[in-house]
Interface confidence: medium
């Protein structure tokens, strides 16, 4: 039996920050679980981890240096990513593992979310169009 995961197909990070919600076909209340967010088609980079147990005190960390946080809903985990770089535009996959109570459960691979990080480009002011041609 596998948990199904729903994610937005695409998100745009305009201010180098984005909230990605992972929705599960499973209620995480009073469960010991490990929710994680992975970057790349091969999910090679573990961006952020949210670990929860019955006390409902979440442990959140990124061993890959991302600025991330997480919030828990009954059937969802929302990852908050900040200080993203343009070159971190990629596809991101939600993963969930339920360790307790038995049986161990994990998810079918989701379709992922493309996070498009928009850089902050300085635009020339229309008040100063530059030198005009004679």
């Amino acid at each position: 039996n596998k948990i199904l995961v729903k994610q937005s197909p695409m998100l745009v990070a305009y201010d180098n920050a984005v909230n990605l919600s992972c929705k599960y076909s499973y209620n995480l209340f009073s469960r010991e679980f490990r929710a994680s967010l992975h970057k790349g088609l091969d999910s090679a980079v573990e961006v952020c981890v949210v670990y929860g147990n019955y006390s409902q005190q979440l442990q959140v960390y990124s061993k890959t240096g991302f600025n991330c946080d997480g919030k828990l809903g009954n059937e969802s985990v929302t990852f908050y990513l900040q200080n993203l770089y343009v070159n971190q535009t990629d596809i991101y996959f939600c993963k969930i593992e339920v360790m307790y109570p038995p049986p161990y459960l994990d998810n079918e691979k989701s379709n992922g979310t493309i996070i498009h990080v928009k850089g902050k480009h300085l635009c020339p002011s229309p008040l100063f169009p530059g030198p005009s041609k004679p």
Epitope: L58, Q59, V60, G70
Partner: nanobody, 123 residues
């Protein structure tokens, strides 16, 4: 090398306030939940409070709820603990730690601890 340096402790009268600071270096501070724990004289370690990496979530032990406030400034790599309405039973050495280090403190992560700062509440 990971370094955590606590400061701000001291002697305070019951009902008084203190603000503890913890300056972190040697790891990616904004990437980890951080905690305060304390050790009263002759007692074991007691968890006090946790804050998530970007400060979205905070947690407190029942014994300090409503009196202590945890916060962090990721731009300064610094963790804080504002302690109000202090009681004699708050007397302890206060330590900050990266949360995974605390949960795995029987392992090699034990180095992720500071020297602590002593808080004495007495009249």
């Amino acid at each position: 090398e990971v370094q955590l340096l606590e400061s701000g402790g001291g002697l305070v009268q019951p009902g008084g306030s203190l603000r503890l600071s913890c300056a972190a270096s040697g790891f990616t501070f904004p990437a980890y939940s951080m905690i305060w724990v304390r050790q009263a004289p002759g007692k074991g370690l007691e968890w006090v409070s946790t804050i998530s990496p970007l400060g979205y979530s905070t947690y407190y032990a029942d014994s300090v709820k409503g009196r202590f406030t945890i916060s962090r400034d990721n731009s300064k790599n610094t963790l804080y603990l504002q302690m109000n309405s202090l009681r004699a039973e708050d007397t302890a050495v206060y330590y900050c730690a990266e949360q995974t280090a605390y949960l795995n403190r029987a392992t090699e992560h034990f180095d992720y601890w500071g020297q602590g700062t002593l808080v004495t509440v007495s009249s």
